[in-house]
């Protein structure tokens, strides 16, 4: 299982991505919780779904990174990137995003957690 924790301050922009290179794929999908698609890319185009993220997300199909602008506390969730490989099987990566209010203590905690995550990636 691939699971990464991220902590960010509300109002900031965030990039959700994985630390490894993507397998050769024919479809890439980002989910917010297990049943809600945010965006799906196949070899032709990106399709953005009706969701609370519409208009403030962008997918980089090359890296698989998902850019979210102006994150709010309600964006706290586990995000899943699913890749459908050319072989016909899929792989998932999960990012647990915690959005904190921009109080001084929260910012300090966020910096601590981000430092910890940078040095201890969980897979």
């Amino acid at each position: 299982m691939h699971l990464v924790h991220m902590t960010v301050v509300s109002g900031s922009n965030v990039t959700l991505n994985i630390s490894e290179s993507l397998p050769e794929n024919k479809q890439l999908t980002w989910f917010y919780t297990f049943d809600q698609k945010i965006v799906e890319w196949d070899s032709r185009k990106s399709k953005y779904f009706e969701s609370k993220f519409k208009g403030r997300v962008r997918l980089d199909p090359q890296s698989g990174a998902l850019y979210i602008s102006k994150v709010q506390k309600e964006d706290n969730s586990t995000y899943i990137m699913r890749v459908l490989k050319k072989t016909g099987n899929e792989q998932e990566w999960k990012i647990k995003l915690q959005v904190l209010d921009p109080g001084l203590n929260d910012i300090f905690e966020a910096q601590k957690i981000e430092w910890h995550e940078h040095h201890h990636h969980h897979h």
Epitope: M1, E40, T78, G88, E90, E92
Partner: antibody, heavy 120, light 107 residues
Framework: QVQLVQSGAEVKKPGASVKVSCKAS????????MHWVRQAPGQGLEWMGG????????SYNQKFTGRATLTVDKSTSTAYMELSSLRSEDTAVYYC?????????????WGQGTLVTVSS | DIQMTQSPSSLSASVGDRVTITCKAS??????VAWYQQKPGKVPKLLIY???TRHTGVPSRFSGSGSGTDFTLTISSLQPEDVATYYC?????????FGQGTKLEIK
């Protein structure tokens, strides 16, 4: 190997509730979503809903929203489906089925099924 | 909700025949389609997923094809043990939906 073992058959009166359990083994319970599918006698398959055992997030078929409740007990790797306000049309075999990963609800693993009979 | 319409609803064929079952989605589901086989009194068994990938242990006579809205399950040479009801399922969009089933019998 992956196993999903469901509770036994139930006979209920109209208006009552039923709670069916599904005990999972042979894999990490929190890494795959669990779904419930029912099949009325001689009829096809009908998806009722799914639950993420890790987060408790649920997704329901609108037809069952308000009547079906999906829960899990992580400590025992057990999923539950409770259906309330039963009527005769709810007579069916109820299956739990494990998805492939969190986000791919195709079902290679199924419980043996639980027959729920609703009769006055 | 996405409707999955299977045809035919029942069919009778001889051992060795090539059998084709079709499934039409009411909107584009990409390739997020699975096919199941259910024998009387038994649990459904996954045959095909992502429209064309055979599940582990499924005989090579079973194949799937299609994308978008039109999908096909083919049995290249019908065997007596293939008597069952076959269901398609879309998992592109919630709620998940199944076709109404195709009952396959031997002539």
């Amino acid at each position: 190997q992956v196993q999903l073992v469901q509770s036994g058959a139930e006979v209920k009166k109209p208006g009552a509730s039923v709670k069916v359990s599904c005990k999972a083994s042979g894999y990490t319970f929190t890494e795959y979503t669990m779904h419930w599918v029912r099949q009325a006698p001689g009829q096809g398959l009908e998806w009722m809903g799914g639950i993420n055992p890790d987060t408790g997030d649920t997704s329901y078929n609108q037809k069952f929203t308000g009547r079906a409740t999906l829960t899990v007990d992580k400590s025992t790797s057990t999923a539950y489906m409770e259906l309330s306000s039963l009527r005769s049309e709810d007579t069916a075999v109820y299956y739990c089925a494990r998805a492939q990963f969190w986000t791919t609800p195709r079902f290679a693993y199924w419980g043996q099924g639980t027959l729920v009979t609703v009769s006055s | 909700d996405i409707q999955m319409t299977q045809s035919p609803s029942s069919l009778s064929a001889s051992v060795g025949d090539r059998v084709t079952i079709t499934c039409k989605a009411s909107q584009d589901v990409g390739t997020a389609v699975a096919w199941y086989q259910q024998k009387p009194g038994k649990v459904p068994k996954l045959l095909i997923y992502w429209a064309s990938t055979r599940h582990t242990g499924v005989p090579s006579r079973f194949s799937g094809s299609g994308s978008g809205t039109d999908f096909t399950l083919t049995i290249s040479s019908l065997q007596p043990e293939d008597v069952a009801t076959y269901y398609c399922q879309q998992y592109s969009t919630y709620p998940i939906t199944f076709g109404q089933g195709t009952k396959l019998e031997i002539k």
